[in-house]
């Protein structure tokens, strides 16, 4: 339920981070793709009533009503059609907010990889952030936490997971002997490599940080076409949203 071996980031230095809440409690992470769109993990919404869900943007300390925070309801949830709950295959979804975020220093967008981008290679340095609990016993962190990790060779990872992974998953490891990575309430949050969202926190093993079961993410590059297709179909807008740039060949 928490970032392992990480540190608290400078407040609002990760303006794309979204907190998905149910019943007033932080449940999962996500990232802001467009002013009205958040990307998260599909498993975060299993057996959940969207009417009770909220998305908080511009947050650092979740327990504080910070002036930078913007809170939205969820208008619509689009889960990948091939999402499989037990294997976590295609563990990705898009949330359409019930309003448009006002972009600024504390609320900003994170770009996914380009349409033809390849996943980061083994050894690539990345970072993963989240508000998951920072102790065994459900204490919230003082603020947004982040850990530095490295991409793990997919064959090595698949072997660790006894062949259960799919080609659209991505794994990370600690860069050294210290345990670093994510835990359950960090689900849906982005793995950022070279300033792009290359992964979404998906699952780990019987406990977090076990080197025998490396952290597994949804490989965002495999779903870029689907992401933009959903956004295009659901939001027929004539031009880019204020403060955004549209990657070549990608609909707003």
């Amino acid at each position: 339920a928490q970032i392992i071996g990480g540190h608290e980031v400078t407040p609002h230095s990760r303006p794309y981070m979204a907190s998905v809440r149910f019943g007033g409690q932080h449940h999962c992470g996500g990232f802001l793709l467009r002013a009205r769109w958040v990307v998260s993990a599909a498993h975060c919404f299993s057996h959940r009533d969207l009417r009770t869900g909220l998305v908080v943007l511009g947050a650092h300390v979740l327990s504080t009503a910070e002036p930078t925070q913007q809170v939205f309801g969820i208008d619509a949830l689009t889960t990948h059609p091939d999402y499989h709950p037990m294997t976590h295959a295609n563990d990705i979804c898009l949330l359409r907010l019930n309003g448009s975020a006002v972009l600024g220093p504390a609320v900003g967008l994170l770009r996914p990889p380009g349409r033809r981008a390849r996943p980061p290679t083994a050894g690539t340095r990345c970072r993963v952030a989240g508000w998951g609990f920072v102790s065994d016993f459900e204490e919230l962190p003082p603020g947004l936490m982040e850990a530095k990790v490295r991409v793990l060779d997919p064959d090595v990872c698949n072997s660790s997971w006894k062949g259960h992974l799919t080609l659209t998953m991505l794994c990370t490891r600690s860069g050294d002997s210290h345990r670093r990575g994510f835990c359950s309430a960090d689900s849906g949050g982005p793995l950022v490599c070279r300033n792009r969202a290359h992964g979404l926190v998906s699952f780990s093993g019987l406990w977090c940080g076990d080197p025998k079961t490396p952290d597994v993410y949804t490989q965002v590059s495999a779903f870029v076409a689907w992401i933009w297709d959903v956004v295009r179909r659901s939001s027929p807008q004539p031009g880019p949203l204020p403060g955004t740039t549209r990657p070549p060949g990608e609909a707003a």
Epitope: I4, D136, F203, W207
Partner: antibody
Framework: EVQLVESGGGLVQPGGSLRLSCAAS????????IHWVRQAPGKGLEWVAG????????DYADSVKGRFTISADTSKNTAYLQMNSLRAEDTAVYYC????????????WGQGTLVTVSS | DIQMTQSPSSLSASVGDRVTITCRAS??????VAWYQQKPGKAPKLLIY???FLYSGVPSRFSGSGSGTDFTLTISSLQPEDFATYYC?????????FGQGTKVEIK
């Protein structure tokens, strides 16, 4: 209040089967993994199996691999241990425990259920 | 699998004594060690996690220390309710493994 209640223990003949249940209340499965730990009479604690209900990932002690199956029904907040091909050395009190994901500690345990394998 | 070796296997002590139990891991487990107390006919209870953190509700006379391969549980002043069996457990990697236990008896 967090509670774990085991049931399903009893006397069974060698080669027989039993299914243990662990009913959880006071918390939701999603933040934890559920484990079975056993204790043979007068002996120490031995981890048997564990499951992460969020993704169904399971693991087993070598001593029970291929004979025991752990499962969970998240809608019922219940975990199960299906024990087949039971042997005399499986005789023990079986505890289910909640393991907190962060550092792998078992913070709540059930009261235990006795499984006796004897002819 | 990682082996956890506890010593002593049993000890006799009096109320008020300082008691130390050690646990050695067969390989580096960082600080991923917990200590449990078990009384006859009862389930184990968590005392210490992450080698040195006192679990909620556990008296402050219990403390833990160590990292790497060597770990210690200390009871600063033994109380009548502390006579029990104590187990260490590593949670560095699966499978989780326990020490064989240390029985603390009344002298």
């Amino acid at each position: 209040e967090v509670q774990l209640v085991e049931s399903g223990g009893g006397l069974v003949q060698p080669g027989g089967s039993l299914r243990l249940s662990c009913a959880a209340s006071g918390f939701t499965f999603s933040g934890y993994s559920i484990h079975w730990v056993r204790q043979a009479p007068g002996k120490g604690l031995e981890w048997v199996a564990g499951i992460s209900p969020t993704n169904g990932y399971t693991d087993y002690a070598d001593s029970v691999k291929g004979r025991f199956t752990i499962s969970a029904d998240t809608s019922k907040n219940t975990a199960y241990l299906q024990m087949n091909s039971l042997r005399a050395e499986d005789t023990a009190v079986y505890y289910c425990a909640r393991l907190v994901f962060y550092r792998g500690v078992m913070d709540y345990w059930g009261q235990g259920t006795l499984v006796t394998v004897s002819s | 699998d990682i082996q956890m070796t506890q010593s002593p296997s049993s000890l006799s002590a009096s109320v008020g004594d300082r008691v130390t139990i050690t646990c050695r891991a067969s390989q580096d487990v960082s600080t991923a060690v917990a200590w449990y107390q078990q009384k006859p006919g009862k389930a184990p209870k968590l005392l210490i996690y992450s080698a040195s953190f006192l679990y909620s509700g556990v008296p402050s006379r219990f403390s833990g220390s160590g990292s790497g391969t060597d770990f210690t549980l200390t009871i600063s002043s033994l109380q009548p309710e502390d006579f029990a069996t104590y187990y260490c457990q590593q949670s560095y990697t699966t499978p989780p493994t326990f020490g064989q236990g240390t029985k603390v008896e009344i002298k």
